[in-house]
């Protein structure tokens, strides 16, 4: 769904593009869910514009968003999470554009955290581990993770590994010796829920050991 304004509906026939995008985060604060929307064009004049969600809500017909600078935000327990909601951009009582969205299809997980890399000298490998708050959640529990790593000097040469667990082993022979590496991880819903990649975790930096010339093996760090 494009979310483009039906400009023919506007009395003054303005050509403003009110397209917007949203993402939901479930159980982001205890049992509270959140919904964040923003205009795709950062230069839209948002002075009198409001967002409203109606339908697929518990106990209420509609909810208004809070405006936080350039974003619009709701935190609530009232999302039914079954069926589609109607999200509208409004000026007063007039709707400029609306989108019908199932909030379970626009889920953005929280970023993974506690990323670390441990070198195992005997095994000649690096064990990558990280954590995710979603292990404790009731709804969005199953995630696909994208671990990306690169030699720090290679700005855009990222190697990506997809996995469903929170542990990955990198073989030492696949990495350059005596090099600084950067590694990071993000997550996306992978079961009933659909949506977007999380933000990246904070990066972790590690150095690979040097090669021991006599044996052709790497020296420990």
């Amino acid at each position: 769904e494009s979310g483009y304004a039906q400009n023919g509906d506007l009395e003054d026939a303005e050509l403003d593009d009110y397209s917007f995008s949203c993402y939901s985060q479930l159980e982001v604060n205890g049992s509270q869910h959140s919904l964040t929307c923003a205009f795709e064009d950062p230069d839209v004049n948002i002075t009198n514009l409001e967002f409203e969600i109606c339908g697929a809500l518990v106990e209420v017909k509609c909810l208004n968003f809070r405006k936080l600078q350039e974003i619009y935000f709701i935190e609530t327990k009232k999302f039914l999470l079954i069926g589609k909601s109607n999200i509208c951009v409004k000026v007063g009582e007039k709707s400029l554009t609306c989108k019908k969205i199932d909030l379970t299809t626009i889920v953005k997980p929280e970023a993974p955290f506690d990323l670390s890399v441990v070198y195992r000298e005997g095994a000649n490998d690096f064990v990558v581990t990280f954590n995710t708050s979603h292990l404790q959640k009731k709804y969005v529990k199953v995630l696909m993770h994208d671990v990306a790593y690169r030699q720090e000097k290679d700005e855009n040469k990222w190697t990506h590994v997809n996995l469903s667990s929170t542990k990955l082993t990198l073989l030492q022979r696949k990495l350059q010796p005596a090099a600084m590496y950067e590694i990071k991880v993000r997550s996306i819903p992978d079961h009933y829920f659909k949506g977007f990649w999380s933000e990246w975790s904070p990066s972790y930096y590690f150095r690979t050991p040097e090669i021991n010339n006599s044996s052709g093996e790497m020296d420990p760090i």
């Epitope: 982001v28 964040t36 923003a38 929280e110 990066s203």
Partner: nanobody, 113 residues
Framework: QVQLVESGGGLVQPGGSLRLSCEVS????????MHWYRQASGRQREWVAT???????GYRDSVKGRFTISRDNAKNTVDLQMNGLQLEDTAVYYC???????WGQGTQVTVSS
């Protein structure tokens, strides 16, 4: 063009305090998680703290209870209040918005008696 400008570093005695600030431009700041990293001389860069777009905070173990990260979405700034500074906190501190292709110049924090 993304710009990250850190400030507020300086020389402080152990146990002292500093407040670092980072001004961000060129991104939709309100929608981004923001991070502080640091790099001590001869060491690799390490993560220090994060504040998510929703305001949730996280810290590396060695600074928990001493450092506080905060953000002001109206000013596009992220701050790091550092109390109880220790010798091992000496480093250049950098803020980052999640894309590590972009770094500011950093701000030097030196803890010395």
């Amino acid at each position: 063009q993304v710009q990250l400008v850190e400030s507020g570093g300086g020389l402080v005695q152990p146990g002292g305090s500093l407040r670092l600030s980072c001004e961000v431009s060129g991104i939709r700041f309100s929608l981004r998680n923001m991070h502080w990293y640091r790099q001590a001389s001869g060491r690799q860069r390490e993560w220090v703290a994060t504040i998510t777009a929703g305001g949730v905070t996280g810290y590396r173990d060695s600074v928990k209870g001493r450092f506080t990260i905060s953000r002001d979405n109206a000013k596009n700034t992220v701050d790091l209040q550092m109390n109880g500074l220790q010798l091992e906190d000496t480093a250049v501190y950098y803020c980052n918005h999640g894309d590590t292709a972009y770094w500011g110049q950093g701000t030097q924090v030196t803890v010395s008696s």
